[in-house]
């Protein structure tokens, strides 16, 4: 059948999901497309336990997640409800700050150096994390 039981090569399994951690940086939209091209999505954090898992793997580095408010309200890329879901913003965040001088506000969420979340300019080249549910992940190793 089409159901998968293993994560792809170079992905990390955790609680029935597979995670992939970048080592380079991209703008949020490019990171989003990268994950989608891998049949995945930018990471959606649904619990404190998942937050700690991701935080452990990324370390103290700004890293994009699958949360944005580019069309108004905050939305998770997989449709998970934002209002009732897990949140871990830094104090006073999100603030849609316009003072950066880059035009517009701040519409994309990232993990900061302490793991808490901040909204920032989506064009900034941050690292990113992809996630896919285990039964959607390919178990076939890529032929390099």
């Amino acid at each position: 059948g089409s159901e998968r039981t293993c994560c792809p090569v170079n992905w990390v399994e955790h609680e029935r999901s597979c995670y992939w951690f970048s080592r380079s940086g991209k703008a949020w939209a490019d990171a989003d497309n990268y994950c989608r091209l891998e049949d995945a999505h930018l990471v959606v954090v649904t619990s404190w336990e998942e937050q700690k898992f991701v935080q452990h793997h990324i370390g103290p580095v700004n890293t994009w997640m699958g949360l944005h408010d580019q069309n108004g309200p905050w939305k998770w890329v997989d449709g998970t409800d934002y209002e009732t879901g897990f949140k871990n913003w830094r104090p006073e965040q999100p603030d849609d700050w316009y003072g950066h001088g880059l035009g517009g506000g701040e519409d994309c969420a990232h993990f900061t150096d302490d793991g808490r979340w901040n909204d920032d300019v989506c064009q900034r080249p941050y690292r990113w994390v992809c996630e896919t549910e285990l039964d959607k992940a390919s178990q076939e190793p890529p032929l390099l």
Epitope: D30, P125, K136
Partner: antibody, heavy 123, light 107 residues
Framework: EVKLLESGGGLVQPGGSLRLSCAAS????????MSWVRQAPGKGLEWVSA????????FYADSVKGRFTISRDNSKNTLFLQMNSLRAEDTAVYYC????????????????WGQGTLVTVSS | DIQMTLSPSSVYASVGDRVTITCRAS??????LAWYQQRPGKAPKVLIY???SLQSGVPSRFSGSGSGTDFTLTISSVQPEDFATYYC?????????FGGGTKVDIK
Amino acid sequence: EVKLLESGGGLVQPGGSLRLSCAASGFTFSSYAMSWVRQAPGKGLEWVSAISGRGGNTFYADSVKGRFTISRDNSKNTLFLQMNSLRAEDTAVYYCAKRGFRFLEWLGGFDYWGQGTLVTVSS
Amino acid sequence: DIQMTLSPSSVYASVGDRVTITCRASQDISNWLAWYQQRPGKAPKVLIYAASSLQSGVPSRFSGSGSGTDFTLTISSVQPEDFATYYCQQGNSFPLTFGGGTKVDIK
């Protein structure tokens, strides 16, 4: 040996439709994103569309969005491009291309290309 | 969209000459750049990926360099089979975009 073989090209009138196919062999097809790239006569290369390995996500150039649909059948190792509302400016050789170097953190370069199939849109 | 500009559009060389082709991106693409060779009537063939990595089976006379917005492809000593058209392509963002092509012709 990786092989990509396109078919389905031909002469079609403006406003008409055509479906291109690309038969793949020599690699684990479902593990790789695939793209269509075209080349108008005497012109350069233009990326048209891409699809993820399992087919869940698709991407298009603005010039074909809403008219072309990329799809794949992993059980048959085949890539497709459904082209509707064709225009004269769609006249080109259409190549299917395999996303290469997956260990890189990029959206793609292409390590293998088919030989191409010619699509001519003319009345 | 990211524009890719190749220069020159054509270059004339003799066998044994050193040829350098330049590709400029309209915005930073890190090192996410590939170079292709296309002979008349044939499909493109990848030469260089990630700006400077030589594809397996490609002669070592081909080399690539650069990062950010400025990249070069160098053929250290042109051989008869190298007379062809060369393209750069950025792989950082959708839509993927190619430079317009540089034709290397016999002088």
